[in-house]
């Protein structure tokens, strides 16, 4: 299953499959997730080691048993790959690292006014993988405001150095935020020239294209079909690059297919997995296990659940079958692709779905009438769980926020439905940033069921929580995916990085905002909160957040939206925007429904019809 816990001051011994430099443990974990054989990782922050060569070292590890012995190492951070973790799987990494210079091949330098502008330039450059920016206070005046665009053979820095007044980060192309745009077309009977960066075997051009998209240096590809004239080159997928970023030439060639990486696509990237099953095809590789199962789909599920399995072949040969079950061969290789692809067989083959963003689970948990005042504009994909609950009567308007917690579930505030309990009048918009982008053609979700907490009473602040079941499940993308829920009764975690988002009023007597707003607000203890609200009962099922001096808060139109906190690199839904005295007033914190206190209720209500809780437990 999915394991998200990080181990502080611990280092996994042995099992090394690759090593690289990464700026933090989260980026190291992401590289582990996307490495075909990595199950575990260990990271050495600069503070944890004197050896300059090992600082920022990220060590990717494999283990037949799925675990390795942990040794104590002060400052080290270790953890698991996020394979099998559904919507948490993403190659997108937005963080900017202050005081750090990520080294690589510098291929472009320009003057810019901010690190954000530098990151934008990197994201809009086809070859840029990461960047460094010298701030205005950099010690050498001639380098100030320099934006260095960089790449490296592996897509990670060749070295990372601690350097004052330098800020570094990665391209946001994997966040589907590139302005370059992409070529979706593939070209039949055409071969591209230029430099081959890798060679893998794939069953079709679309798998080849997805592998190219997630390979750090692939810009385009050529695939040789299974009827290519040279037998030894059939099903070969050549991943390619060039200095210019485009093929310098192409040759008409029967039975070849060429195309481009989709990394520069805006708004949608292909999932980093291959879900199609190929009948009449055998995938060769190292044998991991052989099991008897009923049907090729069960074989694929078995492969997906066995974390080391990369691909499989389900044999229909009479000697491989008994009764209704046949042999399911679970296999792996060094690069995650079959070492041999054979056609005309009595089998069906396919890949593990361990890197698919869309698990079957409906709700994500972890084991362990109120715009935002004083906020700033959010950017695309920053809060992909945020939804807008809108009512269509004669006109259509935004009324509340909400949080996507599963393919078919939204969590919001009960008071959003005061006087509007009819599910037909509601439209739920997900994956949006600007309300003005909504037109009559914008897709929306309709409500199948509104589940208001049984103890909620209109115009009371208690139990202000409601679940919405959508009529149809949503697909997950970089701009539309769920927020994880806290564990039941989560009281031990100290959250220090919490944000509230919404399109609500920017002042008490304001109006709904166009661009989704965000504000960083500290949590306030319930005792402190109770002092500020002497006329109300602040229960343990509420959580408060705000600045003593006011100025930043949720407001009308933010109700039902999320209060999220980042802990160990993972966002969790800590609160649901509920109520407060005015907006952003001094010593009047916002009051939020404490999600951890309602976990039993959420789990009970989101259970599937067959009685299984549709929950994902990444830890």
């Amino acid at each position: 299953g999915c394991l998200t816990q990080l181990y502080e001051n611990a280092f996994f011994r042995g099992g090394d499959v690759a090593s690289m430099y990464t700026p933090n443990a989260q980026y190291c974990q992401m590289r582990c997730t996307f490495h075909p054989r990595c199950l575990l990782f260990s990271f050495l922050p600069a503070s944890s080691i004197n050896d300059m060569e090992k600082r920022f070292g990220c060590f990717l590890k494999d283990s037949v048993t799925g675990t390795l012995p942990k040794v104590h190492r002060t400052g080290a951070v270790s953890g698991h790959s996020l394979k099998q973790c559904g919507h948490q799987i993403s190659a997108c990494h937005r963080d900017i690292y202050k005081g750090v210079d990520m080294r690589g091949v510098n291929f472009n330098v320009s003057k810019v006014s901010s690190v954000e502008e530098c990151q934008k330039r990197c994201t809009s450059n086809i070859r840029c993988q990461f960047f460094s920016y010298a701030t205005q206070t950099f010690h050498k005046a001639e380098y100030r405001n320099n934006c260095l665009l960089k790449y490296s053979p592996g897509g990670t820095p060749t070295a990372i150095k601690v350097l004052s007044n330098v800020e570094s980060g990665f391209s946001l192309k994997p966040c589907a935020l590139s302005e370059i745009g992409c070529h979706m077309n593939i070209f039949q009977h055409l071969a591209f020239s230029d430099v081959d960066v890798a060679r893998v075997l794939t069953p079709d051009a679309f798998v080849c294209r997805t592998i190219c998209t997630y390979h750090p240096n692939c810009l385009f590809f050529t695939f040789y079909t299974n009827v290519w004239k040279i037998e030894s080159q059939r099903n070969v997928c050549l991943l390619k690059t060039s200095e210019s970023g485009t093929p310098s030439s192409s040759t008409p060639q029967e039975n070849t297919i060429s195309g481009y990486s989709l990394l520069t696509c805006k708004r949608t990237l292909p999932e980093p997995c291959h879900s199609k099953i190929y009948p009449g095809v055998d995938f060769g590789g190292e044998e991991l296990n052989v099991t008897f199962v009923k049907g090729v789909n069960v074989c694929q599920e078995t492969c997906t659940k066995m974390i080391r399995c990369q691909f499989f072949t389900y044999s229909l040969l009479p000697e491989d079958c008994k009764e209704e079950k046949c042999k399911c061969f679970l296999r792996l290789s060094m690069d995650g692709s079959p070492t041999r692809i054979a056609y005309g067989t009595q089998g069906s083959s396919g890949y593990s779905l361990r890197l698919c963003n869309t698990g079957d689970n409906s709700v994500c948990t972890t084991k362990t009438s109120t715009r935002i005042v004083g906020g700033t504009n959010s950017s695309w994909g920053e809060w992909p769980w945020q939804v807008s609950l809108q009512v269509k009567l004669t006109a259509q308007r935004h009324l509340c926020g909400g949080s996507l917690i599963g393919h078919q579930w939204v969590l919001t505030a009960a008071h959003c439905f005061d006087g509007l309990p009819l599910q037909d009048v509601w439209r739920i918009y997900s994956g949006i940033l600007n309300l003005s982008d909504i037109t009559k053609d914008t897709p929306f979700s309709q409500i199948k069921e509104i589940i208001i907490h049984q103890n909620y009473k209109v115009s009371e602040g208690n139990h202000d929580i409601a679940l919405i079941k959508l009529q149809a499940p949503l697909n997950y993308t970089e701009f539309q995916k769920p927020i994880c829920l806290p564990s039941k009764g989560d009281t031990s975690t100290i959250y220090t990085n919490c944000w509230v988002t919404g399109w609500g009023f920017s002042k008490e007597k304001g109006e709904i905002q166009n661009i989704l707003q965000k504000v960083n607000i500290p949590l306030v203890t319930n005792e402190e909160c109770q002092k500020r609200y002497q006329d109300y009962k602040i229960t343990q099922r509420m959580v408060c957040a705000g600045y003593k001096e006011g100025g930043k808060d949720a407001c009308k139109g933010d109700s039902g939206g999320p209060l999220v906190c980042k802990h160990n690199g993972m966002w969790r839904l800590v609160g649901i925007t509920s109520w407060g005295e005015g907006c952003a007033r001094r010593e009047q914190p916002g009051v939020y429904t404490k999600v951890a206190e309602y976990m039993d209720w959420i789990l009970e209500k989101t259970q599937s019809s067959d009685g299984k809780a549709q929950m994902q437990s990444p830890a």
Partner: antibody, heavy 120, light 107 residues
Framework: EVQLLESGGGLVQPGGSLRLSCAAS????????MIWVRQAPGKGLEWVSV????????MYADSVKGRFTISRDNSKNTLYLQMNSLRAEDTAVYYC?????????????WGQGTMVTVSS | DIQMTQSPSSLSASVGDRVIITCRAS??????LNWYQQKPGKAPNLLIF???TLQSGVPSRFSGSGSGTDFTLTISDLQPEDFATYYC?????????FGQGTNLEMK
Amino acid sequence: EVQLLESGGGLVQPGGSLRLSCAASGFTFSAYMMIWVRQAPGKGLEWVSVIYPSGGVTMYADSVKGRFTISRDNSKNTLYLQMNSLRAEDTAVYYCARGTVGASDAFDIWGQGTMVTVSS
Amino acid sequence: DIQMTQSPSSLSASVGDRVIITCRASRSIATYLNWYQQKPGKAPNLLIFGASTLQSGVPSRFSGSGSGTDFTLTISDLQPEDFATYYCQQSFSDPYTFGQGTNLEMK
């Protein structure tokens, strides 16, 4: 020239049998997935059956399972559809088509179709 | 089985118009979606495969987009020869189902 040519259609009584053939030319028949698709008068396209290159893997629509058998003779470059226990609802134009290689399993080459009428 | 739902089922348009036909799959099919054109008494003709790639010989006024469950076929500048029935078809998993068709007729 790449071509598919169906034959064997005609009028048959309910419960009867018919064997359709599809002769391929102009391409390496043995390397391609082949399918049968049918179209009832005035209706849409309905996928009937598929056979993968060696003939080892075949699949059928639920509506014909147990009654129809797809096969191929790679040495003769010919695709077959054996239709038994025919019913009135099997009345349609039957097309054979070739699956694309290495791309989307789309059907890029189609025959002109052969009419099957099941009536008493 | 994966169900394919096309809309609209029929459509009236004039030469020069821009026409959009949509196709929705009952579950995600990645980009394994193909579009065909069929004229009365003729076999279907492949227009687009893999959701967006034009089959060779097909005019560039035809384009396709989408991934996952929602797909569109766009004809940007309708020509007299484009009046026909259009079908989407998924090639993600057997049975390789077709949509019910969209009949494009002259207004």
